[in-house]
Structures are given as structure tokens and as C-alpha cells.
Interface confidence: low
């Protein structure tokens, strides 16, 4: 069986001071001893805890230790459970408070001949007694004008008079100990017929339009007199305003209205008051018009990272004084940490790229708020994502050196060909990201290249050789199209390089050798007597070990070439009449022809009337006119050449026959008649 | 010390696989190119491969596709992974730093055997 | 690629002689040229940098010269120490290739 050797008792306690509740179990086996308080288990705390199996109190608290504990032994294998006597604390205690205004209820109630009544908020167990003091004089019951109630803690005044007036303050005493108030109270009676002052007054500031209000209050026995006078010294009442007052209304518990405030009513209101007896009491209070200004714009800023910086807002002019504050994502900056508000000013330390943005001052005031948006920019140095490489790029095709860095803000890429700055050009194109392209690499390009890329922060860069690979060309490349004269001699070239010489070698494009009297001599293609059968597609190809070979199609044609078989002649005509330019070519292909009169060819589907050209080439021109007059240009061409030839032609007045003449004596030269 | 250190040679049979290692100290390690260079005991000098700052790599023709260059920065570490190993590539394989267009600075080497 | 060719592949010769080793490259590498000194069991030590420039540290008894293929390295006055296997290499384009290297013996 459990058996308690020791249990807890009741005992008197101190508010704050140790205390301990024993209790001491003997059992056959092993117990496990917990508390109730209440019937509520209770729980160890650094003030409350079991000590061995009594229950230790570090400081007795009057509110959490009030109730009934109990030792509760359990033997945790039989289940058998036993419980101690129940013991509490009488706790003492002693807690200091104001003295405060119980009767009436509030100080502006507190007049002559009133019964005023005091509490003194001192509070313990036992209760304690009470004592009170004026002015630090002890008071003892039973004096005149007032009565103590130590049950209720109160001093009474009946009738309060001015004699009243002073600091009253209280001390208790108990069994526990002795304390004072903690906050003591002004009782102030004066003489009723001097005014006094109750409501004053306060400086306002107001946005236009709006409404502005002054309170002002006196109190005298009897009732004193108030008047509003405006700067001039002119009194406002509600049957005499000043013109600039109009919208002014006194209300009859003093206060002023003032509504649609506008500039010309701010300035020094004074509310007088005099009493039946005693000086005139005179108040003063100033009307502001709020007003803020625009804020000045901020610059962009670019800042270095780990540098510290700062950015001042200066505040604009405002009544009242504007508040200012910083914004970063729409979050306001704290007055500490690394990114914080100082005064007006925005300070960034150890600055880290994180730290851009756009950050704001805002400015507030009654008359609006005003907001300016600076933008940080945090510049690092550039880093490499690619640095240019030495190259080897191929003539005539496009060439890239990459220089790819990244920082902020972007960075300024400038690349130098030998040390000398490359202005964008034709050939030259510098992309966004910083690589260089060469549109059309050239074998003088292979050279030095080096690239800079630049912030505020700093600057890096890196160089890479060029080595310009030639490539296997043509030089020139043969015309496509080329014409042999029908039984004459003839060559058609073919060259080209490569960075090995290349070998060069003709053949038909059909695949099939030339014939005997057709020779290949180093890329020279020789036709000892073109024959009709020469005519054709042919292939010359050039080749080399390194690149491979390239071809260059060419389509022979053989022809006769052209040969006038009639010429135009040197013709004069009559005004009016007809003349006939007659022109006749030959060869193969059949030659077409063409007329150009006076430097410009003349178009068979826009002759007009007058011209026409004949299937055979020759050109008629009817009625001809002075201005018909000049060069005409015959011009004969098939698709392996051209040749041209011309002749004048006048046109004169016809001249008015003479007797002596005959019909038959001809013209000084040939004419042509119609 | 600005050193280069070597390590993961060894022997290994033909087609087989090993990965050298290049451990950098003493020096801004990220701000160099860096190459392996081999030598065939007793015989001359040949370079392997080579990377960039950037990671831009380089590689022979007798090598390439089947050797793999790479960097680790933060490790300060060089590597050259070797696949399909012939016995043509038996050698002390150095790893080297390469500025200004010459090799500055040179480890001590690590011996490579590929035999059956 | 660019072959480098050595000459000699081997030389004998006696401390205080004047040696000159010869590099010829198969293309035109302008002054892209380095050699290296390679003493046994040793690891090749840079001794001359862009045809002529000397590397910090390396006696002035060594010195080089040429520029396009055609280079030579000269020991003024061989001392003990020089006995070594000596390389060139070209840098001018990747791949980056050695000579055959050249063994300079005690006589």
C-alpha cells in the first residue's frame, strides 16, 4: 500500500517569495508522484516544479497559485493510486496604484461648492490601511470640509473650495508591507468669476477649400464673455463678418467654422474671453493653407557593386513640413540593415546587384502627396561567356569572332582589326551581343582582332588571330556563255587558285573526250578550226587536294558572225515626203535589227504612225518633219554579237521650181521623191 | 605554391576507359587556358587538347571524339576523359598551362599504359 | 597541320662548345615559336617564347632566332646542365605540334 509520510499543509505565503508544499510517499514499488491543482495536473515551469516529490514555488503568484493542491502517488504497475490532503496558500500581497477622480467624472465637472471624492488604487490582502496627504502633509480623519473611508479607500470633500487645491496623494500599509500611489492627482478650484481657461485654441494647418475648425472655451461663475477677432483686430460674429470671412460661423460653445478655406483667410485667429472679474484671457492660433510642391526629377543612377551609395530626396516645400519617405517594390525601406532610410536620404551599402531597380521618395502632407521615381542601375564588370578564338575562316564566306560577355547594364562591345577601332560598315557588323561578323572575309583580313567590352564598372577584353583560308575560285570565273567564229581559230580560257595550285582540265558536259583537233593546255581550252559540231555544253574544273574540286559550266555556240549586206546611206529628203533607210544584215544565228535615231532606240510598239520598220530591217519614215532630221543607227545583233552602222539624214524645204529649169535637170543630190 | 598535380594514370586494356584529373593551386585558376600534353616513354612531345576560359575545348585529329577536355572552376580542377583507349596512347600525360601562346607552367605527369 | 623538324636528332658535344639546333616548320608560323628544354625524368621547362624572347630565369647563353620556318636555338657556351633533350613548338594554330626534339649528349 502507498503510504504519505509527509503531505502537504496550508500555509500563509508572500506575493513573489519561495514557497514549498512536501509531500513524501512509501510504497512496495516504485511510484510516480504528480500534482493536481484544482484537479488540473500541473505542469513544471522555471517558477513552479517538483522537487523530488514535493512541489518547489520559485515566487508565489497571488492570481496562478490560488486553489487547491493535491500529491497524487501512482504505482504505475498495480494501478493503485493514492492522494494527499488538499493545502492552499493564503497569499499576502500589497500592489500600488493611482490616485484617480471617482466623483464627479471628470476634472472639467470639478466646480466650487462641488463634493469632489478621491480613490486610492492601492489593493492587497489583508487590506491594507489607508492614509492620505495634501501636498505631502498627512490628512486625518475627521478634519473639516473632509471624510476618509478606509472600506471604501476614498477621500471625500464636501464642499470643495479653492482651499482644496493641491497634490493629493496615499500610502497603505499590511501585514505585508507598505506602498505609495503610483500616480498622484492635481486638484485645482479657482475663483469662479475669473474666466478660465477650458478649450484652447490649436495652431491649424488646412487644404484649400477645406473646412477649418478652432475651438475655444471659458468658463467663469457667471458665464464669461468670448469674442473671435481676425488679424486686423476685426470681430467676427455671426451677424458681422469681415468681407473675407463670409463663410465664418461662430457656434455658440465658442468654436469657429471656417469652410472653403481659401489663401486670403489664413493668418492669426484670437479668441478673447473675460470674466466678471480678472484680466481679459487672450488665445491665439494660426490658420496655414497647406501647400506642396512638385518634386524635382531624379537622374538615372548607375552604381558600382560592393560600393556604398547614397541618394538624397530632397523633400519638396510643403506646409506642413512634408513626411518623406523611400520605397523599394512597393515595400517602404526600413531605417536600418544594408538598404535603409536615413533622414531623406536613400542609402544602398555594399551595394549588390540585387539592390536594381526603380526606387521612390514619396512626400506627403494635408495638401497631397508628391512621388519621384529614381532608377538604379547596379554596373558590374563584364565576364566572359565566350571569349573570340583564334579563327580560321574561309575567304569570300561570311566570318564570326564571338565576344559574349555579360554584365550590368548591357555592356558596350568595340572591336579593333591591328589595333585599329572597326567602324560598322559594309563589310563589318557588330551584333547586339558583341560578335563581330565579316560579311565577305577577304584574305587581307587575316589579322589581329580584339574586343573590349566596357560598363562603369570596368572593362575586359581579349584579342584572337584570324587566319584567312583562300579558297578554290575561279580567277576569273569563265562567261557562262561564250561564242566561237564558224571556221576560225579560237581559245576560252579557264584559271584558278586555291591554297594548292590547283590542277585544271576541260571536258563535255555530256561526259564524252574532246575531239583530237580540240586541245586542253592548262586550263586553256584551243580550237584549232571551229567546226559546227564544236558548238555545246562544256565543264571546266578545277581541283585540289585540301578542297576538292569546283566546276564552271560554259555553253559554246558557234556562229557566222554578222556582216551588213545593205548599209544605210547618207539620205536627204523633202519636208513632208517619205524617207527610206534601208539596212540588211547576215549571219548565224539569224541577226535581228534595231534602229536608234538621235541617241535613243527606237521601240516597234511605240513608232507611232509615221515610222514603221519592214520584216527586212529597213526604216520608213512618212511625212517627214525638220526635227526628223539627224543620226540613225542601224544596229545588228544575234546572241553572239553585234554590229552597227549609220548613216544622216536631212530634211530640207522643197524649193520652188524655176522657168529656166527643166523637168528633167536632177538635184545636187540624191533625193529621195514621193 | 602556383603547382599542377596530376593523377588518375594507370593501366588499362585496350577499348578500355580512364579519366585524368588536374589538380591547380597558386594561381587565379578560371583566367587560364588549359591543355593536356603527352609523351610516349623516351619519345617526344604531343598535345592532346586543350580548353578555354570560356570552355571553348580543342582537340587533334588523332584524338578527337574519343578524348573529352574539361574544367571545374570552383574545384580549380582540370580533366581529360579517355575513351576507347588504343595502345598508341601509352604515355606520361602532363597538364599545362598555356599563356601568351606558350606553355608556362607544367605538372609532373601521370603515367597512362594501355596493354592487354 | 603544321609539321615541326628538328635538326639534329642528336649531338655530341663538350662543355664550353657553341651549339645551334635547328627547327624548320612546314608552313609559314611567323614568330609563333617556343622552345623547351626537357632534362631526364624532368618535365619540360619553357625556355624561349616567341622565336627570341627569352623567358624569365633561362641564362643568356641561350638564344633564339628566325621567323616564318626557319628557326634556330643557340647554346653559347654549353655547360653541364644543358645536357638535356631540347624541343621547339609552334603556337600559331591548333593543333599546337612539337618537333622531334633534339638530345644533346656529352661527347
Known amino acids: 500500500a502507498i503510504v504519505f509520510i509527509k503531505q502537504p499543509s496550508s500555509q500563509d505565503a508572500l506575493q513573489g517569495r519561495r514557497a514549498l508544499l512536501r509531500c513524501e510517499v512509501e510504497a512496495p514499488g516504485p511510484v510516480h508522484v504528480y500534482w493536481l491543482l484544482d484537479g488540473a495536473p500541473v505542469q513544471d515551469t522555471e517558477r513552479r516544479f517538483a522537487q523530488g516529490s514535493s512541489l518547489s514555488f520559485a515566487a508565489v503568484d497571488r492570481l496562478q497559485d490560488s486553489g487547491t493542491f493535491q500529491c497524487v502517488a501512482r504505482d504505475d504497475v498495480t494501478g493503485e493510486e493514492a492522494r494527499s490532503a488538499n493545502a492552499s496558500f493564503n497569499i499576502k500581497w500589497i500592489e500600488a496604484g493611482p490616485v484617480v477622480l471617482k466623483h464627479p467624472a471628470s476634472e472639467a465637472e470639478i466646480q466650487p461648492q462641488t463634493q469632489v471624492t478621491l480613490r486610492c488604487h492601492i489593493d492587497g490582502h489583508p487590506r491594507p490601511t489607508y492614509q492620505w496627504f495634501r501636498d505631502g502633509t498627512p490628512l486625518s480623519d475627521g478634519q473639516s470640509n473632509h471624510t476618509v473611508s478606509s472600506k471604501e479607500r476614498n477621500l471625500t470633500l464636501r464642499p470643495a473650495g479653492p482651499e482644496h487645491s493641491g497634490l493629493y496623494s496615499c500610502c497603505a500599509h499590511s501585514a505585508f508591507g507598505q506602498a505609495c500611489s503610483s500616480q498622484n492627482f492635481t486638484l485645482s478650484i479657482a475663483d469662479e468669476s475669473f474666466a478660465r481657461v477650458v478649450l484652447a485654441p490649436q495652431d491649424v494647418v488646412v487644404a484649400r477649400y477645406e473646412e477649418a475648425m478652432f475651438h475655444c472655451q471659458f468658463s467663469a461663475q457667471p458665464p464669461p464673455s468670448l469674442q473671435w477677432l481676425f488679424e486686423d483686430e476685426t470681430p467676427i460674429t455671426n451677424r458681422s463678418r469681415p468681407p473675407h470671412l463670409r463663410r465664418a460661423t461662430v457656434f455658440a460653445n465658442g468654436s469657429l467654422l471656417l469652410t472653403q478655406v481659401r489663401p486670403r483667410n489664413a493668418g492669426i485667429y484670437r479668441c478673447i474671453g473675460q470674466g466678471q472679474r480678472g484680466p481679459p484671457i487672450i488665445l491665439e492660433a494660426t490658420l496655414h493653407l497647406a501647400e506642396i510642391e512638385d518634386m524635382p526629377l531624379f537622374e538615372p543612377r548607375v552604381f558600382t557593386a560592393g560600393s556604398e551609395e547614397r541618394v538624397t530626396c530632397l523633400p519638396p516645400k510643403g506646409l506642413p513640413e512634408p513626411s518623406v519617405w523611400w520605397e523599394h517594390a512597393g515595400v517602404r525601406l526600413p531605417t536600418h540593415g544594408r538598404v535603409y532610410q536615413k533622414g531623406h536620404e536613400l542609402v544602398l551599402a555594399n551595394i549588390a546587384e540585387s539592390d536594381a531597380g526603380v526606387y521612390t521618395c514619396h512626400a506627403a502632407n494635408l495638401a497631397g502627396q508628391r512621388r519621384q521615381d529614381v532608377n538604379i542601375t547596379v554596373a558590374t564588370v563584364p565576364s566572359w561567356l565566350k571569349k573570340p578564338q583564334d579563327s580560321q575562316l574561309e575567304e569570300g564566306k561570311p566570318g564570326y569572332l564571338d565576344c559574349l560577355t555579360q554584365a550590368t547594364p548591357k555592356p558596350t562591345v568595340v572591336w579593333y582589326r591591328n589595333q585599329m577601332l572597326i567602324s560598322e560598315d559594309s563589310r563589318f557588323e557588330v551584333f547586339k551581343n558583341g560578335t563581330l561578323r565579316i560579311n565577305s572575309v577577304e584574305v587581307y583580313d587575316g589579322t589581329w582582332y580584339r574586343c573590349m567590352s566596357s560598363t562603369p564598372a570596368g572593362s575586359i577584353e581579349a584579342q584572337a588571330r584570324v587566319q584567312v583560308l583562300e579558297k578554290l575560285k575561279f580567277t576569273p570565273p569563265p562567261q557562262p556563255q561564250q561564242c566561237m567564229e564558224f571556221d576560225k581559230e579560237a581559245t576560252v580560257p579557264c584559271s584558278a587558285t586555291g591554297r594548292e595550285k590547283p590542277t585544271i582540265k576541260w571536258e563535255r558536259a555530256d561526259g564524252s573526250s574532246l575531239p583530237e583537233w580540240v586541245t586542253d593546255n592548262a586550263g586553256t581550252l584551243h580550237f584549232a578550226r571551229v567546226t559546227r559540231d564544236d558548238a555545246g555544253n562544256y565543264t571546266c574544273i578545277a581541283s585540289n587536294g585540301p578542297q576538292g574540286q569546283i566546276r564552271a559550266h560554259v555553253q559554246l555556240t558557234v556562229a557566222v558572225f554578222i556582216t551588213f549586206k545593205v548599209e544605210p546611206e547618207r539620205t536627204t529628203v523633202y519636208q513632208g515626203h517619205t524617207a527610206l533607210l534601208q539596212c540588211e544584215a547576215q549571219g548565224d544565228p539569224k541577226p535581228l535589227i534595231q534602229w536608234k535615231g538621235k541617241d535613243r532606240i527606237l521601240d516597234p510598239t511605240k513608232l507611232g504612225p509615221r515610222m514603221h520598220i519592214f520584216q527586212n530591217g529597213s526604216l520608213v519614215i512618212h511625212d517627214v518633219a525638220p526635227e526628223d532630221s539627224g543620226r540613225y543607227t542601224c544596229i545588228a545583233g544575234n546572241s553572239c554579237n553585234i554590229k552597227h552602222t549609220e548613216a544622216p539624214l536631212y530634211v530640207v524645204d522643197k524649193p520652188v521650181p524655176e522657168e529656166s529649169e527643166g523637168p528633167g535637170s536632177p538635184p545636187p543630190y540624191k533625193m529621195i521623191q514621193t | 605554391e602556383v603547382q599542377l598535380v596530376e593523377s588518375g594514370g594507370g593501366l588499362v586494356q585496350p577499348g578500355g576507359s580512364l579519366r585524368l584529373s588536374c589538380a591547380a593551386s597558386?594561381?587565379?585558376?578560371?583566367?587560364?587556358?588549359m591543355h593536356w600534353v603527352r609523351q610516349p616513354t623516351g619519345k617526344g612531345l604531343e598535345w592532346v587538347s586543350s580548353?578555354?576560359?570560356?570552355?571553348?575545348?580543342n582537340y587533334p585529329g588523332s584524338v578527337k571524339g574519343r578524348f573529352t577536355i574539361s574544367r571545374e572552376n570552383a574545384k580549380n580542377s582540370l580533366y581529360l576523359q579517355m575513351n576507347s583507349l588504343r595502345a598508341g596512347d601509352t604515355a606520361v600525360y602532363y597538364c599545362?598551362?598555356?599563356?601568351?601562346?606558350?606553355?608556362?607552367?607544367w605538372g609532373r605527369g601521370t603515367l597512362v599504359t594501355v596493354s592487354s | 597541320d603544321i609539321q615541326m623538324t628538328q635538326s639534329p636528332s642528336s649531338l655530341s658535344a663538350s662543355v664550353g662548345d657553341r651549339v645551334t639546333i635547328t627547327c624548320r616548320a612546314s608552313q609559314s608560323i611567323s614568330n609563333f615559336l617556343n622552345w623547351y628544354q626537357q632534362r631526364p625524368g624532368k618535365v619540360p621547362k619553357l625556355l624561349i617564347n616567341?622565336?627570341?624572347s627569352l623567358q624569365s630565369g633561362v641564362p643568356s647563353r641561350f638564344s633564339g632566332r628566325g621567323s616564318g620556318t626557319d628557326f634556330t636555338l643557340t647554346i653559347g657556351s654549353l655547360q653541364p646542365e644543358d645536357f638535356a633533350t631540347y624541343y621547339c613548338q609552334q603556337s600559331y594554330i591548333t593543333p599546337l605540334t612539337f618537333g622531334g626534339g633534339t638530345k644533346v649528349e656529352i661527347k
Open positions: 616567341a622565336a627570341s
Open positions: 599545362a598551362r598555356w599563356v601568351n601562346w606558350y606553355f608556362g607552367l
Open positions: 580548353i578555354g576560359t570560356a570552355g571553348n575545348t
Open positions: 597558386g594561381f587565379t585558376f578560371s583566367s587560364y587556358d
